[in-house]
């Protein structure tokens, strides 16, 4: 069991267009038709103004318009919504595709891709209905933009929700050596597939991917829970042969100084083909980017069950550790280090500043505000330490 | 491992809809996977129908698309088919299935279904 | 949609003889260097079972007697020696592009 390991289907809360939880200081815009179109109309359900955003320019052929929402913090954004124009029923503007960005500093924007490469997402096929996206996988943003598409001169208009949880882990990057291919009688492709930082030299380093995505994989690595992947799609795993130091070394950068409790490693650790659990486990801590690693590294080895060949979640304890970067070294102990999920028990170390520069507001883990509730494929449920939207029979 | 149950009506009446239910039991169906509902012909052709992808998003047989609509119900982890305006050619027995990316792992026992006036 | 033409239609194998049926897909099923190819067997009153997955894998629990082999649109399963439990149907299936479809499956008998 992942202690700390958050659930992405319970990670799937408005984050607060519809209920105005987001003030309209935090919705912007590339540009605006007019003041009664202008960003902070893009509220899903909403009725004011005229009853959306809507664009000064065409998004056709260049799609260059964005409607951006700012969360403040960072959150797992697990789900949008979008709907056309209202305008008391006469709206007639809508957009059938939209890509989306997003970044955590304001700086690095990302473009959001599904598991297969695809960045365009379909869209709305009339102005009122509420069509919702799953983002598989979701993405860890402050801020998110839309860039609504056309496939002709038109216009069009958009209002939105974000659906998600705050992005407890405070996880904003992790460096890793690519991922590798293990040959059996089919290719196992042990990428990170979903990271959305650099790739240089062989190194993965400024974003997150597969590791922090809250997927855990089965006990076979060349299985998927997920559907039309290829073998080997939620592990990230080396091969010792390309290791002559005989262990991989990852780095972790987190938002703000924390003491770290803990870091849970799911491994895998099927062993008729190779995958061993790590032999053990070496972390050292700074504070910040330019500084010397403080004090002596953090060494643990592993015990239990070896020969079980089940997957399962290593604890790595971290001693309360005080450190805002941490670079762990994971000892082979078999041909093969497979890990489908990192992640990291902790808590903020009081009065230190977040790291992406401003101090945030205060935001709760599970945002208060409700979901769209006037189509039928949304599910409600009571509030408490339960989700409060889930996506049901959306279309893709 | 995964259980599956498939519950609901024995016999339709043409041109009505018929609905079946799903019951998953020892997995969520918001952890993972694709939650699929098949059919198998009285002269034992398979059809795929559809499913709900573990994150809610659904896919339908293109022959199918016009008729077909697959739910969930999360609290009770459960699965739902409905197939409106059955004909004769509709009977059959109908399976929920799940499936990751190596096919359709786990099977329920299967609920035939007659569609007669 | 992918067409899946399973032959023979019917086989009939000695015991502790070799069973071998066939698949041919009206396009390849291969992506990421796999193939999207499952074979299950089916016994009458019961649910289809998972054999053998991505064309050569062979499912957990299932005996090693069982093997399958092809890429892109042809594929095989195998079974041996055979054994009388072997008696049933055969599909194959590919989840390489939607709609997942099945062949009209190869009946196995014992001579």
């Known amino acids: 069991d992942m202690k700390g390991h958050f659930d992405p289907a319970k990670c799937r809360y408005a984050l607060g267009m519809q209920d105005r939880t987001i003030p309209d200081s935090d919705i912007s815009a590339s540009s605006s038709w007019s003041d009664s179109t202008a960003a902070r109309h893009s509220r899903l359900e909403s009725s004011d103004g005229d009853g959306a955003w809507c664009p000064a320019g065409s998004v056709f052929p260049k799609e260059e318009e964005y409607l951006q929402v700012d969360l403040q913090r960072l959150h797992l954004v697990a789900l949008v919504g979008t709907q056309g124009r209202h305008a008391g029923g006469l709206g007639k503007e809508f957009s059938r595709s939209y890509r989306l960005r997003y970044s955590r500093d304001g700086r690095r924007w990302m473009g959001w891709k599904d598991r297969w490469g695809q960045e365009v997402i379909s869209g709305n096929e009339d102005p009122e209905g509420v069509v919702l996206k799953d983002l598989g996988p979701p993405m860890v943003a402050r801020l998110v933009r839309f860039y609504p598409r056309a496939d002709r001169v038109m216009s069009v208009c958009l209002r939105v929700e974000l659906y998600g949880c705050l992005w407890r882990d405070g996880l904003l990057s992790y460096t890793a050596p690519v991922g590798q291919t293990m040959y059996l009688s089919e290719a196992v492709y042990l990428n990170d597939s979903t990271y959305d930082g650099h790739t240089v030299g062989g190194l993965q380093y400024g974003g997150l991917g597969q590791l922090a995505d809250g997927v855990v994989g089965l006990d076979d690595f060349r299985k998927s829970q997920e559907l039309r992947v290829w073998p080997g799609y939620d592990y990230v795993g080396w091969s010792n042969h390309s290791f002559s130091s005989g262990y991989v070394e990852m780095e972790f950068e987190f938002d703000r100084l924390r003491a770290f409790q803990a870091m849970q490693v799911h491994c895998n650790n099927m062993h008729t083909l190779g995958a061993r659990l790590p032999g053990g486990v070496e972390c050292r801590f700074r504070r910040g980017p330019a500084m010397a690693w403080e004090g002596e590294p953090m060494r643990h080895n592993l015990g239990g069950n070896l020969g079980d060949p089940r997957a399962r979640a290593v604890s790595v304890p971290l001693g309360g550790r005080v450190a805002r970067f941490l670079q762990c070294r994971f000892l082979f102990a078999g041909p093969w280090l497979l890990f489908s999920e990192i992640s990291f028990i902790s808590d903020v170390v009081n009065n230190s500043s977040p790291a992406l520069g401003g101090t945030f507001p205060p935001a709760p883990w599970w945002p208060p505000g409700p979901p769209p509730t006037n189509f039928s494929s949304l599910e409600l449920e009571p509030r408490g330490q339960q989700p409060v939207a889930k996506a049901e029979g959306s279309p893709t | 491992d995964v259980h599956l149950q498939e519950s609901g009506p024995d016999l339709v009446k043409p041109s009505q809809s018929l609905s079946l239910t799903c019951t998953v039991t020892?997995?969520?169906?918001?952890?993972?996977?694709?939650w699929h509902w098949i059919r198998q012909f009285p002269g034992n052709k398979l059809e795929w129908m559809g499913y709900i992808h573990y994150g809610g998003s659904t896919k339908y047989n293109s022959s199918l698309k016009s008729r077909i609509s697959i739910t969930r119900d999360t609290s009770k982890n459960q699965f739902f088919l409905q197939l409106k305006s059955v004909t004769t050619d509709d009977t059959g027995t109908y399976y929920c299935?799940?499936?990751?990316?190596?096919?359709?792992?786990?099977w329920g026992q299967g609920t035939l279904v007659t569609v007669s006036a | 949609d992918i067409v899946l033409t399973q032959s023979p239609t019917s086989l009939a194998v000695s015991l502790g003889q070799r069973a071998t049926m066939s698949c041919r897909a009206s396009?390849?099923?291969?992506?990421?260097?796999?193939?999207?190819m499952h074979w299950y067997q089916q016994k009458p009153g019961q649910p289809p079972k998972l054999l053998i997955y991505?064309?050569?894998n062979l499912e957990s629990g299932i005996p090693a007697r069982f093997s399958g082999s092809g890429s892109r649109a042809d594929f095989t399963l195998s079974i041996n020696p055979v054994e009388p439990d072997d008696v049933a149907t055969y599909y194959c299936?590919?989840?390489?592009?939607?709609?997942?479809?099945f062949g009209s499956g190869t009946k196995l008998e014992i001579k």
């Open positions: 299935a799940t499936s990751g990316n190596y096919g359709f792992a786990y």
């Open positions: 299936q590919q989840s390489n592009e939607d709609p997942f479809t």
């Open positions: 991505r064309a050569s």
């Open positions: 396009e390849s099923v291969d992506d990421y260097g796999t193939s999207f």
């Open positions: 020892d997995y969520s169906i918001t952890s993972g996977y694709g």
